[in-house]
Amino acid sequence: PTGAVEVQVPEDPVVALVGTDATLRCSFSPEPGFSLAQLNLIWQLTDTKQLVHSFTEGRDQGSAYANRTALFPDLLAQGNASLRLQRVRVADEGSFTCFVSIRDFGSAAVSLQVA
């Protein structure tokens, strides 16, 4: 590894109303020549490491979280690794970690508050 992948998430919690959709923002800076085939993106529940959503081997592997999550596929190549969480429930409240690996890796956690 030549240097950590810088992963950026908002410092403040994301606040969402029950039943609405929430976007957990996460971004990284792709190097010149970056292709999605190099990307391993894993969203997990921070504390338990439960898989939420992933993008590996050049394709979206889908939701592992009650089929209520989605990425923004058209924006991934530009470094947008944000996760859309649909029909937010009270039980969704907590910390989600965005893990990005492109040769090297980095990760950051974003908190979701449900109102």
């Epitope: 240097g3 893990f99 990760s107």
Partner: antibody, heavy 116, light 108 residues
Framework: QVQLQESGPGLVKPSGTLSLTCAVS?????????WNWVRQSPGKGLEWIGE???????NYSPSLKSRVTISIDKSKNQFSLKLNSVTAADTAVYYC?????????WGQGTLVTVSS | EIVLTQSPGTLSLSPGERATLSCRTS???????LAWYQQKPGQAPRLLIY???SRATGIPDRFSGSGSGTDFTLSISRLEPEDFAVYYC?????????FGQGTKVEIK
Amino acid sequence: QVQLQESGPGLVKPSGTLSLTCAVSGGSISTSNYWNWVRQSPGKGLEWIGEIYPTGNTNYSPSLKSRVTISIDKSKNQFSLKLNSVTAADTAVYYCARGYNYFDPWGQGTLVTVSS
Amino acid sequence: EIVLTQSPGTLSLSPGERATLSCRTSQSINAILLAWYQQKPGQAPRLLIYGASSRATGIPDRFSGSGSGTDFTLSISRLEPEDFAVYYCQQYGSSPRTFGQGTKVEIK
């Protein structure tokens, strides 16, 4: 290239506190990564101890949680492990390592023996 | 916690032969949440494979990972002298992260 180096006493008395430091070079400890302690003993193999994020957030192994404290010093680009009330069962090689999921790179490890 | 069981404990092979190492998890995990390490005497473990099948930087293509559910495999297509070592699997689909007990690949 990020490199890690553990340091600290190689001998700790039973019921005492094990204290180790991991110096990070070749990169900033403030980058978006988790910093971990892992130990390896003949009896228990490789065992994850805990992790810290640059914000100071920590997660610990349930089996060691009551005895472990991991802290970070961004000004010195290092993080530390304290394990109290040690017994002979805590004798192991202690490694520091980077990563939220898998670990890469690792320090070279330091042997800590608990004995009177 | 998830328990990882590796087999065999020791594998005795000659250089040039193929090595197949097994790792079984006590609970099913997504394949992208498994890693493999190599450890030589007196050294720290070195990351070989992550995401079940992605090679870490600088790892030769004779190393490959596969598997799903509870059964995972590390294959070394043609053993080189430097490949004789202990290999560990590790899961990161559940906290705490846990390791297998290791498989030693020794020269026959």
